[in-house]
Amino acid sequence: MNGRVDYLVTEEEINLTRGPSGLGFNIVGGTDQQYVSNDSGIYVSRIKENGAAALDGRLQEGDKILSVNGQDLKNLLHQDAVDLFRNAGYAVSLRVQHRLQVQNGPIGHRGEGDPSGIPIFMVLVPVFALTMVAAWAFMRYRQQL
């Protein structure tokens, strides 16, 4: 049974100030701990209540973190990624990829490398065009009456 999950992907720069208990989130992923198939990226696994990230409100569980203070998180071991966050200083700039799930197939979660997902605009554009053509045809038909 082949399910399909489609995503609307957006990127955002999030600037966090380290709080009394730190940045307040957990991560999974890395070259030695692939969390998403065909993707060794770093993902937010848990946002801690009342932590800096939770209070800011923009970082979400499931977000992919692309860089920390401009440093790319590609091809890093899990512990190296953790250390990068711990040594990132007081003001921390995160480049983040949010993925909004727009259609749920029978199978849960899919890696970036899996080509089966269709970008949402490829679905919406033809649907919009068909709607416009149908509306135009309907108006022409009514005029002939």
Partner: nanobody
Framework: DVQLVESGGGLVQPGGSVRVSCVSS????????IGWFRQAPGKEREGVSC???????YYVDSVKGRFIISRDNAKNTVYLQMNSLKPEDTAVYYC????????????????????WGQGTQVTVS
């Protein structure tokens, strides 16, 4: 539903050994940090040992060389082998689970854990 169940405690003589187990259900252990904590009567809960989501083990100084933590992801179980036990090791031992790795502290910090077991008593006497 996430659940952690400890077992294997009991009464042990000083210098003896015991192994406590923590069986998890409701989640895939692979991506979780698992910690062992203990609380003696009238004292605060303290970190004993933990194993992070990529299998690194950590120990508090007082148990280094005596305790060994291990995990069996296939059985969804984490073990704490306690050797050369001392009366001061007497406590209720709890296991806890946390999804992923905290970017703020090691897994010995009990503030970071979301899920806790009910505990198992270990008495060294």
């Amino acid at each position: 539903d996430v659940q952690l169940v400890e077992s294997g405690g009991g009464l042990v003589q000083p210098g003896g050994s015991v192994r406590v187990s923590c069986v998890s259900s409701g989640f895939i252990l692979d991506y979780y940090a698992i910690g062992w904590f203990r609380q003696a009567p009238g004292k605060e809960r303290e970190g004993v040992s933990c194993i992070d989501s990529v299998g690194r083990a950590y120990y508090v100084d007082s148990v280094k060389g005596r305790f060994i933590i291990s995990r069996d992801n296939a059985k969804n179980t984490v073990y704490l082998q306690m050797n050369s036990l001392k009366p001061e090791d007497t406590a209720v031992y709890y296991c806890a689970a946390d999804f992923g790795s905290s970017v703020d502290s090691t897994c010995l910090n009990n503030q970071q854990y979301d899920y806790w077991g009910q505990g198992t008593q270990v008495t060294v006497s």
